[in-house]
């Protein structure tokens, strides 16, 4: 009686179980009663990453330098090329098909997490006691100057965008 299901790494065709092609190879012809499955290696710029019965391999992704892309991992017959972005840029999607410049954190905001090739800058508002007076993709919020430690007093309060202004203590008149 012909099988209705096959073992792992096999597939059912014409009422019989044929071996799947291993990763890196494509199907040329199904097995028969007398012959094994015939598989062929993917060409140099193609891949298949699973046990399969595909008749065509997939083309390696191209990391186009004109789009700011660079190769993170070269493609092989069993794995696709992995792209990432050049320094100063990050991917616009998970599949990393193009890149955009990292976002800068505006004054009043500091960098919580520096951008990578695959993620943008994460900014956070400067909390009380901290400030940022620049637009930057690297600078964190900086603490207000401590006037007391310099034997000075606060002449102008700080904000999330400006540091405090320190000045000399008023001398008491005799």
């Amino acid at each position: 009686e012909p099988p209705t299901a096959c073992r792992e790494k096999q597939y059912l065709i014409n009422s019989q179980c044929c071996s799947l092609c291993q990763p890196g190879q494509k199907l040329v012809s199904d097995c028969t009663e007398f012959t094994e499955t015939e598989c062929l290696p993917c060409s140099e710029s193609e891949f298949l990453d699973t046990w399969n019965r595909e008749t065509r391999c997939h083309q390696h992704k191209y990391c186009d330098p004109n789009l700011g892309l660079q190769v993170q991992q070269k493609g092989t017959s069993e794995t696709d090329t992995i792209c990432t972005c050049e320094e100063g840029l990050h991917c616009t999607s998970e599949s990393c098909e193009s890149c955009v410049p990292h976002r800068s954190c505006l004054p009043g905001f500091g960098v919580k997490q520096i951008a990578t090739g695959v993620s943008d800058t994460i900014c956070e508002p400067c909390p009380v006691g901290f400030f940022s007076n620049v637009s930057s993709a690297f600078e964190k919020c900086r603490p207000w100057t401590s006037c007391e430690t310099k034997d000075l007093v606060v002449q102008q309060a700080g904000t999330n965008k400006t540091d405090v202004v320190c000045g000399p203590q008023d001398r008491q008149r005799a």
Partner: antibody, heavy 116, light 113 residues
Framework: EVQLVESGGGLVKPGGSLKVSCAAS????????MNWVRQAPEKGLEWIAY????????YYADTVKGRFTISRDNAKNTLFLQMTSLRSEDTAMYYC?????????WGTGTTVTVSS | DIVMTQSPSSLTVTAGEMVTMSCKSS????????????LTWFQQKPGQPPKLLIY???TRESGVPDRFAGSGSGTDFTLTISSVQAEDLAVYYC?????????FGAGTKLEIK
């Protein structure tokens, strides 16, 4: 017999141009990726360019990007490297090498000398 | 770019001795998709083009004598010649075949006493 033979090297002045070729025989040229690798006198190996079997993927080393162009003619089993804006530091032996994941066959090389 | 560091830069041995040379990469050459290390070893004899010895860190190219063996994973790799012959006089290069730009080590020059 699998063979790669480079040609077209020579003496060129700084700022000049040169096109070197690599003739392939003994294998199905259109199945393989191809590369150029150079070696300055008494120095190590430096990969400079790659072109995939179907010409869809091309990569360059930063040292030659914008100055050198790799190309291939699968009908004529030939690989090319067009070099422009040549500098003295481009003086080297230029090898072509075929690849299917690794450089398994190399040519004997052609010498390029950049000097005034 | 991945930096490949080879050591020693040169070594002199007597025929019949065992030799090991090291190659370290500045980042892992292990492809997580297929668990292969994309590290290649070449031999370059004086006046000749390089010749492939080992690919995927440990797979010997056909026709290469079995005295040549590659090992290692991730960032640390070794080429061992179990019994050096006079014809092994050459410079040995390791190469990152994991990502572009493909980069080579500076080489280890093997001299025979």
């Amino acid at each position: 017999e699998v063979q790669l033979v480079e040609s077209g090297g020579g003496l060129v002045k700084p700022g000049g141009s040169l096109k070197v070729s690599c003739a392939a025989s003994g294998f199905t040229f259109s199945d393989y990726g191809m590369n150029w690798v150079r070696q300055a006198p008494e120095k190590g190996l430096e990969w400079i360019a790659y072109i995939s079997s179907g010409r869809s993927n091309i990569y360059y080393a930063d040292t030659v990007k914008g100055r050198f162009t790799i190309s291939r003619d699968n009908a004529k089993n030939t690989l090319f490297l067009q070099m422009t804006s040549l500098r003295s530091e481009d003086t080297a032996m230029y090898y072509c090498a075929r690849s299917w994941g690794y450089f398994d066959v190399w040519g004997t090389g052609t010498t390029v000398t950049v000097s005034s | 770019d991945i930096v490949m560091t080879q050591s020693p830069s040169s070594l002199t041995v007597t025929a019949g001795e065992m030799v090991t040379m090291s190659c370290k990469s500045s980042q892992s050459l292990l492809n997580s998709g297929n668990q292969k290390n994309y590290l290649t070893w070449f031999q370059q004899k004086p006046g000749q083009p390089p010749k492939l010895l080992i690919y995927w860190a440990s797979t010997r190219e056909s026709g290469v004598p079995d005295r040549f063996a590659g090992s290692g994973s991730g960032t640390d790799f070794t080429l061992t010649i179990s019994s050096v012959q006079a014809e092994d006089l050459a410079v040995y290069y390791c190469q990152n075949d994991y990502t572009y730009p493909l980069t080579f080590g500076a080489g280890t020059k093997l001299e025979i006493k």
